[in-house]
């Protein structure tokens, strides 16, 4: 093809020419190309009008092209270019007009390009620029040059992993002249020693990220005090898991936060035991979102009912016991992967709509009732990957629930009553791998709106699937894999008119029967892989519903003998439905073991007696 | 397949091969070398990714003396405000990082352990690299 050795991803639009040892821009790519990836080619030098042949370009990736020189007008003619990526080029010479002609550029990535200063970076005319990423460079001064006043659309400025040590009032002077309240600024991984008090006074930012910046606690404390007067929608403070500088931590380091106006606050990776931190929390009482990630925290009883938090996130923290959580305004609580408190205790969260309590190894003495959470507004509840959860109440007061996940927790008392009877609005239910033994046909009664039911990895009395789905008239997805099933009721699926996907894989079925699927007019996917299917259990195999598009019978134990000839022929007749048909192999007899079922030619003669 | 030696410890010998077509060079150092009976140390990685690292996860396929364990998925980078600094690494950017590790050992039986690490990243998801680690465990060696 004309574009080779490049790869045509979307004809006439997208071409990938990555790592092809090109020394120059290829000339066999269509004029109409919009996305061009030339990364990892030794281009080394970009002269004027280098891309004249591609006037329609919108995205140009020049990562790791060993570019050392970019001449005036190198990108001239690229008036539609919106993204230019220059990551990993050891640029030594950048002409003043290097970026001229880029009248639509919105994203410029100049990460790891040996950039030593923003002052000499010739981008002042790029009025459309929204995102400037100059991370991983050699920039020492945080002074935002005068030309920034032209960049009125700038939303993201990434200066992380540079060499900035000091921030002075004059550095941010230009921000006072422009209404950039939407600017997100990332200064992480700069060795900051000093922020002059007043430097951020009356400056508004959308997001400020300061992670792994400070070598010791006193520096952190004075620098946070230096942020006084800043109004920021989201502030992210702390460290990275693999970039730890602070040996210890105490709450006084964060006292300066009281002098900021913050809407959302996130603290990550601080090795400390935050104890008695009510003063700090009081400073942050009016934020709408509060996150602690990987922070050792003894107790959070200091959270006040009156805090205005609407979203609280506690992830991978250590607690002495499950915290007392009583918060009037909270709408979302994410409490995941925490260590310490092993037993859940009631929370009082009257506005709560979203609750994720997954991956904590918690035991629940009872579940689930409005009284456990103090709310009747709950729509989303994730209790997955916990310990023993004893089902003692059928969700009284939690009738608004739409999403419920118990996977990989150990559910007790599931077959004693209709646990889900109140949940007429539930759309998604996952009880996979919950040690549930279905011994009660009313287990799913009440789930009138349910669309997705995942119950893989459980078991059934006598390994028989009874008529337990009678209420689930809106079900579209059902996973019954790994349930040790051997037989099913012929009417098990009779009410599931909307079912589209049915996973019966990894069970112990020895024969295939199409009869139970006759009432599934919407069925598109049926997976019977990893069973022990040898044959069909009746002579007359009916057709599957006409809607069926994918039938998976791989990794079964097909008996490729004459007595099963009609079944094997039937399988061949379903050829257009079969998924990975080449993995359907004979198990018996031994001389045919491993042979693909579809390639068999079984000619059997009837013995006349 | 060329084997790249990583290190030897008192109870393990670790090496890897590439299990993808690309075989983009990756440098791995472990100090001190992992002891299966339990150890802590630093894993140093030097790598130039061929795609953005954001939303990185590993698929782990572990084989113990030719018995295959179920696939494990380990999410490393979720996409914003991530735990690790390398989650923000872009295609073509040098990743030169040290990650501390510690684990309490469980009693491993003597033998050969294989761990295929499929690194998937980006949106749309594609393979970043694939390494197959060979760990030979000699519980009683000095």
């Amino acid at each position: 093809e004309s574009w080779e050795p490049c790869v045509e991803v979307v004809p006439n639009i997208t071409y990938q020419c990555m790592e092809l040892k090109f020394y120059k821009i290829p000339d066999n790519i269509p004029f109409s190309t919009k996305n061009l990836d030339l990364s990892f080619n030794p281009l080394r030098h970009l002269g004027s009008y280098s891309f004249l042949r591609f006037p329609e370009l919108q995205v140009l990736d020049l990562s790791r092209c060993e570019i050392q020189t970019i001449e005036d007008g190198a990108y001239q003619s690229l008036s539609h270019l919106s993204t230019l990526i220059l990551t990993g080029n050891p640029i030594q010479s950048l002409a003043l007009g290097a970026f001229s002609g880029l009248s639509s550029l919105q994203k410029l990535v100049a990460v790891e390009t040996n950039l030593a200063s923003l002052e000499n970076f010739p981008i002042g005319h790029l009025k459309t620029l929204k995102e400037l990423n100059v991370a991983h460079n050699l920039i020492q001064s945080f002074k935002l040059p005068e030309y920034f006043s032209n960049l009125t659309n700038l939303e993201h400025l990434d200066l992380s992993s540079n060499k900035i040590q000091n921030i002075y009032c004059k550095d941010l002077q230009v921000l006072h002249q422009m209404p950039l309240s939407n600017l997100s600024l990332d200064l992480s991984l700069n060795p900051i020693n000093f922020i002059q008090p007043g430097a951020f006074k009356e400056i508004r930012l959308h997001k400020l990220t300061l992670r792994s910046n400070f070598d010791d606690l006193n520096v952190m404390k004075t620098c946070i005090q230096g942020l006084a007067g800043l109004e920021v929608h989201r502030l992210v403070l702390g460290e990275f898991r693999n970039e730890r500088n602070l040996e210890e931590f105490d709450k006084s380091s964060l006292e300066g936060l009281c002098n900021l106006t913050i809407e959302e606050f996130r603290l990550t990776y601080l090795d400390c035991y935050l104890d008695n931190i009510i003063d700090l929390f009081n400073c942050l009482a009016n934020v709408s979102s509060f996150s602690l990630v990987s922070v050792n925290i003894k107790r959070v009883e200091d959270f006040s009912y009156n805090f205005r938090w609407q979203h609280l996130e506690l992830v991978n923290c250590k607690f002495e016991q499950f915290p007392t959580l009583e918060l009037k305004s909270l709408k979302r609580l994410t409490f995941t992967a925490n260590k310490g408190g092993n037993a859940f205790s009631e929370v009082d969260l009257p506005s709560l709509e979203f609750l994720d309590l997954s991956r904590n190894g918690l035991s629940f003495k009872g579940c689930c009732s409005q009284s456990d959470f103090g709310t009747t507004s709950l729509k989303y509840l994730d209790l997955s990957f916990n310990d023993v959860i004893t089902m003692s109440s059928n969700f009284l007061g939690l009738e608004q629930l739409e999403h419920l996940d118990f996977q990989h927790s150990n559910l007790k008392q599931m077959s004693q009553f209709s646990v889900f009877l109140s949940l007429r609005n539930l759309i998604y239910l996952d009880i996979s791998h919950t040690h549930t033994r279905v011994a009660f046909n009313g287990i799913f009664d009440g789930l009138l709106s349910l669309k997705v039911l995942k119950m893989a990895g459980n078991s059934f009395q006598e390994n028989f699937l009874p008529d337990i789905f009678t209420d689930l008239k809106n079900l579209t997805f059902l996973d019954l894999s790994q349930c040790q099933l051997e037989q099913l009721s012929p009417t098990a699926f009779d009410t599931l008119n909307k079912l589209q996907v049915l996973n019966m894989s990894h069970n112990n079925f020895f024969s295939l029967d199409t009869f139970p699927y006759k009432c599934l007019p919407s069925l598109q996917v049926l997976d019977y892989s990893l069973n022990h299917i040898m044959t069909s259990n009746n002579q007359e195999l009916q057709h599957f519903p006409s809607s069926l598009a994918f039938l998976n019978l791989t990794q079964n134990d097909f008996a490729c003998t004459c007595e099963h000839q009609s079944f094997l022929q039937w399988i061949k007749d379903q050829r257009q439905l079969l998924v990975e048909a080449e993995r359907m192999e004979c198990a018996t007899p031994s001389d045919k073991q491993g042979m693909p079922v579809l390639s068999l030619n079984i000619t059997c003669q009837m013995n006349k007696t | 397949q060329k084997h790249y030696w990583v290190c030897n410890s008192s109870d393990a010998s670790i090496s890897y091969t590439y299990c993808d077509k690309m075989q983009y060079p990756i440098s791995i150092n472990v100090n001190p070398c992992i002891k299966l009976k339990g150890s802590r140390g630093l894993l140093h990685i030097f790598y130039i990714p061929r795609r953005d690292v954001k939303q990185l996860y590993f698929n782990l396929y572990i084989t113990v003396n030719s018995m295959t364990l179920p696939k494990r998925k380990e999410v490393i980078c979720r996409g914003s405000d991530d735990d690790y600094s390398f989650c923000r690494a872009l295609k073509g950017e040098t990743v030169n990082t040290t990650v501390s590790f510690s684990f309490k050992g469980i009693k491993f039986s003597k033998g050969k352990y294989k761990c295929v690490v499929e690194a998937i990243s980006g949106s749309p998801e594609e393979m970043l690299f694939c390494l197959e680690f060979d760990i030979i465990h000699q519980p009683n060696s000095n």
């Epitope: 009883e301 009912y305 009082d348 | -």
Partner: antibody, heavy 118, light 107 residues
Framework: QVQLQESGPGLVKPSDTLSLTCAVS?????????WHWIRQPPGKGLEWMGY???????DFNPSLKTRITISRDTSKNQFSLKLSSVTAVDTAVYYC???????????WGQGTLVTVSS | EIVLTQSPDFQSVTPKEKVTITCRAS??????LHWYQQKPDQSPKLLIK???HAISGVPSRFSGSGSGTDFTLTINSLEAEDAATYYC?????????FGGGTKVEIK
Amino acid sequence: QVQLQESGPGLVKPSDTLSLTCAVSGYSITGGYSWHWIRQPPGKGLEWMGYIHYSGYTDFNPSLKTRITISRDTSKNQFSLKLSSVTAVDTAVYYCARKDSGKWLPYWGQGTLVTVSS
Amino acid sequence: EIVLTQSPDFQSVTPKEKVTITCRASQSISDHLHWYQQKPDQSPKLLIKYASHAISGVPSRFSGSGSGTDFTLTINSLEAEDAATYYCQQGHSFPLTFGGGTKVEIK
């Protein structure tokens, strides 16, 4: 509207076991919440004794732990208090109550006076 | 356990006067403190939860404040029907504990 009603003997002999029952109407005791006993000696303040959770789990005031039992009869929608080895200091008005999700008590029975005397 | 100390034990007040009752906790309990009113021969009635949140149906003359260890219940303009004993209760941790009570009498 939830209503609670205590019942039981008004007079108990020293060293005997005090037994009280709380009948609940308007809400199932297995449907949610925890169900508490509080007592008040004549002319004195309130003392929390213990509770039974809707799941059947119980917890007690450490000062009474060796003598107290709280159980329930779900078919009758009632829960009971047993306090063994009583003495005169156990003379009090005994209240049953329902705790809300937070640790506060919005619903109380009207109380029943139990006198310990020979 | 957390000890709650109420003061005064007794208060005799004329109608329309302002009444202030204080409750001090032996350790910080954030705002996990609740107030009850108990009239003679009646069971306690919840007035205020979480230090300052009035329960619906409670007259607006009752208000609460405080956080940490020091809390106050205020009756802004005392009425004859307010003659009762008032108790604070901490909901910070089990065992639940009550203050000793403050008896308010109408002069």
